[in-house]
C-alpha cells in the first residue's frame, strides 16, 4: 500500500504520500486554534506508471495507454486514498470547544 508506513521509509519517486507539516498560526493565519499548534496534513505526489496502485479499471487502462503512448498527456493522477480526522481545541470566550475535523490527514495515496 502507498501509505505512510511504506512511503516515509523509502525513497520512492512514483506516486506516494509525502510528509507535509502545517503550522496553523504561521502557515494559515489561524491564530485562534489552541491545540494542536499544527499537524502533518501530508500530500500525494509522483507519477502513476502502469499498474501502480490503480484505483479503477479506467486508471489501469489510462496507465497502460500512457505507457504505450509516452507522448500522450493523459495519465492517472496521484490522489489521496485514506484520510483520517484531526481533533482541535479552541476557546469561545473562555469556554473550551473540541471539534473533530474530518478528512484532514492523508494516510495513503492511489492512482486514479
Amino acid at each position: 500500500a502507498l501509505d505512510t508506513n511504506y512511503c516515509f521509509r523509502n525513497l520512492e519517486e512514483n506516486c506516494c504520500v509525502r510528509p507535509l507539516y502545517i503550522d496553523f498560526r504561521q502557515d494559515l493565519g489561524w491564530k485562534w486554534v489552541h491545540e494542536p499548534k499544527g499537524y502533518y496534513a501530508n500530500f500525494c505526489s509522483g507519477p502513476c506508471p502502469y499498474l501502480r496502485s490503480a484505483d479503477t479499471t479506467h486508471s489501469t487502462v489510462l496507465g497502460l495507454y500512457n505507457t504505450l503512448n509516452p507522448e500522450a498527456s493523459a495519465s492517472p493522477c496521484c490522489v489521496p486514498q485514506d484520510l483520517e480526522p484531526l481533533t482541535i481545541l479552541y476557546y469561545v470566550g473562555r469556554t473550551p470547544k473540541v471539534e473533530q475535523l474530518s478528512n484532514m490527514v492523508v494516510k495513503s495515496c492511489k492512482c486514479s
Epitope: G29, Y91, T95
Partner: antibody
C-alpha cells in the same frame, strides 16, 4: 481592499424565513470567522453567531432560540444567515462582520453595509 | 451573559473639548493578561467601525485623538479635541465570555 457586500432589503410575512447573503472580497475568506450582528430600529447591537468558513464550524447566541442558521460557500467567498419563524420583533438591520482574527470570539474589524429585514402581514 | 452598561446614554460636547464614555461590565473581562474589551463608533446611517481593540490598542487608520483605558470591569473611551466627524453612537463590546455582548450605546453630539 477588504469588502463585505450584503444582499438587498427584504420584506417577509410572519412565520416565514429570510436568507441574507454577504459576499466578501479582498482577503482570504477561509482564514477569518464571520459574525452576524443585528440592530433593531433605534436600538443597540446584538451578536447572533459566527461561522468559520473553512469547515463550517458555528457558534450561536442562545438568545435566537435555534432560529438562526449560518452557512458559507467557500467557492464564492460568501456567507449566509437564515432566520426562521420571523416575527415583528425581528425587524432590524442585519450585519455581517469579519472577526479580527486572533480569537474565535473577537472584535470585528470589517462590516457589511447592512440588510434591512421587515416583517409585515 | 455579561451585561455591558455604558454611561452616559448621551452627551453633548463643544468642539475641541474632550469627551469621556464609560463602560462597566457585570463581571471581569480580563483573561490571560488581556482585557477583552473593544470600542466602536456608528456614524448616522453607517455600519459600526472598530476604534479600539483590547481596551487600549488603536485600530489602524483611526485618529490618535481616540484612546481607551481600563481593566477588569471598568473601561473608558476618551475623545480629545472633538470634531463634527466624531458624532454618532459609541458602543463597547466584550468577548471574554460567550455570548459576545455590546453596551447599549452612547450618543455623542456637538453643542
Amino acid at each position: 481592499e477588504v469588502q463585505l457586500v450584503q444582499s438587498g432589503a427584504e420584506v417577509k410575512k410572519p412565520g416565514a424565513s429570510v436568507k441574507v447573503s454577504c459576499k466578501t472580497s479582498g482577503y482570504t475568506f477561509m482564514t477569518y470567522w464571520m459574525n452576524w450582528v443585528r440592530q433593531a430600529p433605534g436600538a443597540g447591537l446584538d451578536w447572533m453567531g459566527q461561522i468559520f468558513p473553512a469547515w463550517g464550524s458555528t457558534n450561536y447566541n442562545e438568545m435566537f432560540e435555534g432560529r438562526v442558521t449560518l452557512t458559507a460557500d467557500t467557492s464564492t467567498s460568501t456567507a449566509y444567515m437564515e432566520l426562521s419563524s420571523l416575527r415583528a420583533g425581528d425587524i432590524a438591520v442585519y450585519y455581517c462582520a469579519r472577526g479580527y482574527g486572533n480569537y474565535a470570539l473577537d472584535a470585528m474589524d470589517y462590516w457589511g453595509q447592512g440588510t434591512l429585514v421587515t416583517v409585515s402581514s | 451573559d455579561i451585561v455591558m452598561t455604558q454611561t452616559p446614554p448621551s452627551l453633548s460636547v463643544s468642539p475641541r473639548e474632550t469627551a469621556s464614555i464609560s463602560c462597566r461590565a457585570s463581571e471581569s473581562v480580563d483573561s490571560y493578561g488581556n482585557s477583552f474589551m473593544h470600542w466602536y463608533l456608528q456614524k448616522p446611517g453607517q455600519s459600526p467601525q472598530l476604534l479600539i481593540y483590547l481596551a487600549s490598542n488603536l485600530e489602524s487608520g483611526v485618529s490618535d485623538r481616540f484612546s481607551g483605558s481600563g481593566s477588569g470591569t471598568d473601561f473608558t473611551l476618551r475623545i480629545s479635541r472633538v470634531e463634527a466627524n466624531d458624532t454618532g453612537v459609541y458602543y463597547c463590546q466584550q468577548n471574554n465570555e460567550d455570548p459576545l455582548t455590546f453596551g447599549q450605546g452612547t450618543k455623542l453630539e456637538l453643542k
